[in-house]
């Protein structure tokens, strides 16, 4: 079951999944000037059995001018260096979730991938939060959120984390110093790398879009 919403937003914090549950989808998005190859995969899918999980499908991008030409999926070393990483080395990670059965690791980058990844999480997915650079964590509890199914609807639990700009205040015992945001973003751009939604193509979906005249201006 896919989660209906994004994980909660915490001011001055970003979130990251350390591993992805089977059923998670990752959009095949390309950076500007590049597009998904003709009839190429729309998404990567975490699949597997009890002993091994991996990402099905490959994302491939091609120059908009030559869309029917397939590009290599493995980035060159210099491209990997330039690309914003989605990894988050975090002291908040209690276990190596990537080694858990039924989970996939972060997929490797593909050539000309968009700078932000759009994930579609499933029920049971856990994401971890940490404060962006310049902010320190005040923990009231776990700095994590889990997508849960309640009464037939999905919801994310609220992470117990506050990020404060008071760098001088003493740290909690055993608390590590705050680390840089994985994106190195200024605090004015604390939107997260990963977003979620129901990705399936369907013609009869529980979505509504109401178009209306919002305001009328006479000029």
């Amino acid at each position: 079951e896919l989660c209906d919403d994004d994980p909660p937003e915490i001011p001055h914090a970003t979130f990251k999944a350390m591993a992805y549950k089977e059923g998670t989808m990752l959009n095949c998005e390309c950076k500007r000037g590049f597009r998904r190859i003709k009839s190429g995969s729309l998404y990567m899918l975490c699949t597997g059995n009890s002993s091994h999980s991996s990402w099905d499908n490959q994302c491939q991008c091609t120059s908009s001018a030559t869309r029917n030409t397939t590009k290599q999926v493995t980035p060159q070393p210099e491209e990997q260096k330039e690309r914003k990483t989605t990894e988050m080395q975090s002291p908040m990670q209690p276990v190596d979730q990537a080694s858990l059965p039924g989970h996939c690791r972060e997929p490797p980058p593909w050539e000309n991938e968009a700078t932000e990844r759009i994930y579609h999480f499933v029920v049971g997915q856990m994401v971890y939060y940490q404060c962006v650079q310049g902010y320190r964590a005040l923990h009231r509890g776990p700095a994590e959120s889990v997508c849960k199914m309640t009464h037939g609807k999905t919801r994310w639990t609220q992470p117990q984390l506050i990020c404060t700009g008071e760098m001088e205040t003493s740290q909690f015992p055993g608390e590590e110093k705050p680390q840089a945001s994985p994106e190195g973003r200024p605090e004015s751009e604390t939107s997260c790398l990963v977003t979620t939604t129901d990705f399936q193509i369907q013609t009869e979906m529980a979505a509504t879009m109401e178009t209306s005249i919002f305001t009328t201006e006479y000029q």
Epitope: D4, D5, D6, N27, C28, E29, C30, R32, R35, R36, K38, S39, L42, S64, A65, R67, N68, A114, E116, I118, H120, S191, T195, T196, T197, D198, F199, I201, Q202, T203, M205, A206, A207, T208, M209
Partner: antibody
Framework: PGRSLRLSCAAS????????MHWVRQAPGKGLEWVAV????????YYADSVKGRFTISRDNSKNTLYLQMNSLRAEDTAVYYC??????????????WGQGTLVTVSS | YVLTQPPSVSVAPGQTARITCGGN??????VHWYQQKPGQAPVLVVY???DRPSGIPERFSGSNSGNTATLTISRVEAGDEADYYC???????????FGGGTKLTVL
Amino acid sequence: PGRSLRLSCAASGFTFSSYAMHWVRQAPGKGLEWVAVISYDGSNKYYADSVKGRFTISRDNSKNTLYLQMNSLRAEDTAVYYCARDLLGSGYDIIDYWGQGTLVTVSS
Amino acid sequence: YVLTQPPSVSVAPGQTARITCGGNNIGSKSVHWYQQKPGQAPVLVVYDDSDRPSGIPERFSGSNSGNTATLTISRVEAGDEADYYCQVWDSSSDHVVFGGGTKLTVL
């Protein structure tokens, strides 16, 4: 003619902020005409030549709402306007879900 | 970029309907097809030339090569009567382009 109008599209049932969104219109008795598209985060916008410079597409992800600001309206802008969802966040390829549409009539 | 569709196609129930969409080297582009019944919003029936969304019957299929894309509806039913539109993304202009539409009449 010459006046302005703002359309809004309230989306629900999916994570609005993950999808590119389109406006497509259909004049009475005519075919579909694409108007504009905006990427999931609002960073990229593209317009049909017929509306470029007059219409502006925008979105408020915190309100799950898509907008179309229409200025300098002409009689030929009379149509049913559909709000529609793209399959990807910035793919602009496949329109997989459409709103029910709203009729805009421009007349003197 | 221009997509050309025949204005109308007629077919008897149970027969096969083929609706074409012509465009310069359209085979190099991904083509998507929409069905629109009177008074309703369009519905995606085929994407990426030949893939079907969930909920769309197997009777709907597509192909695309050269300068022509084709939507094929086998074992046509009365409920298939509608307007059908092809669509592509034109990378040279950064525009979505629709064909003019084809009215399918089930005799």
